[in-house]
């Protein structure tokens, strides 16, 4: 889980070690702050859970790509 020690900086200290189905994911944000120990991606799921993930992992990159495309596609 992400941890906000001194808001508004949120950091990830551990990454999920399991893939989460891309269909469970609603959005993401990148964590690149120098105040954090590592770069990370925080996914928000459709039921509003926040999960820290490793941006180097392929499933994380695929999920971000999928969410980017979903955002770009206008809803009919």
């Amino acid at each position: 889980q992400p941890d906000a020690i001194n808001a508004p900086v949120t950091c990830c200290y551990n990454f999920t070690n399991r893939k989460i189905s891309v269909q469970r994911l609603a959005s993401y944000r990148r964590i690149t702050s120098s105040k954090c120990p590592k770069e990370a991606v925080i996914f928000k799921t459709i039921v509003a859970k926040e999960i820290c993930a490793d941006p180097k992992q392929k499933w994380v990159q695929d999920s971000m790509d999928h969410l980017d495309k979903q955002t770009q596609t206008p809803k009919t």
């Epitope: 070690n17 399991r18 893939k19 609603a26 979903q70």
Partner: antibody
């Protein structure tokens, strides 16, 4: 293509435990979320529990809490479901079910394992 | 927990006629951001595991005949068999995968009249 092959039928006495296995092929178990569903004779489908990567842990239906344990042996890509303190109402077919990364719904099912609880 | 309620519990339909099964969820299974309803329909025949027919409430699984369709969103979902064939005699279940615990409807048995 994911394939799920379950262990064979079991006959158990009331109060005993049963452990059903589900062997995954065509995929790595840790890339899946394995769930277990049971069906008593002539009854509907009942979700028992499964691995929830959103919580990073296995979650169980309240009805089975404390009596069921779901585990994984990642070295053999095999999932297990153990149910203890068996009673006659636990007589059912037990299914493992899972989904791929791109789906989220149960698109793969094991063939089912019949567990009969009888004295 | 989201409760799924199917109606009717059973129905007998003549060959070539329409069969309609309703599934009502106690809360919406629609995620508005992607406009998807997290609902599947399964068909089950005796001695077999459930077979996936429909996902996202209306998308047919590969190989499923087009006489079988899913519709609706949110809390009111429907499975329709437009022209019943002998091989359609089975029990049909809806299931939500929006939030855990994943829950099934009680099932609807479709018989040939």
């Amino acid at each position: 293509q994911v394939q799920l092959v379950q262990s064979g039928a079991e006959v158990k006495k009331p109060g005993a435990s049963v452990k059903v296995s589900c062997k995954v092929s065509g995929y790595t178990l840790t890339d899946l979320s394995m769930h277990w569903v049971r069906q008593a004779p002539g009854k509907g489908l009942e979700w028992m529990g499964g691995f929830d990567p959103e919580d990073g842990e296995t979650i169980y239906a309240q009805k089975f809490q404390g009596r069921v344990t779901m585990t994984e042996d990642t070295s053999s890509d095999t999932a297990y479901m153990e149910l203890s303190s068996l009673r006659s109402e636990d007589t059912a077919v037990y299914y493992c079910a899972t989904h791929e990364f791109w789906s989220g719904y149960f698109d793969y099912w094991g063939q089912g394992t019949l567990v009969t609880v009888s004295s | 927990d989201i409760v799924m309620t199917q109606s009717p519990d059973s129905l007998a339909v003549s060959l070539g006629e329409r069969a309609t099964i309703n599934c009502k969820s106690s809360q919406s299974v629609l995620f508005s951001s992607n406009n998807k309803s997290y609902l599947t329909w399964y068909q089950q025949k005796p001695g077999q595991p459930p077979k996936l027919l429909i996902f996202w409430a209306s998308i047919r699984e590969s190989g499923v005949p087009d006489r079988i369709s899913g519709s609706g969103s949110g809390t009111d979902l429907t499975l329709t068999i437009s022209s019943l064939q002998a091989e359609d005699a089975a029990v049909y279940y809806c299931q939500q995968y929006y939030s855990s615990p994943w829950t099934f409807g009680q099932g609807t048995k479709v018989e040939i009249k």
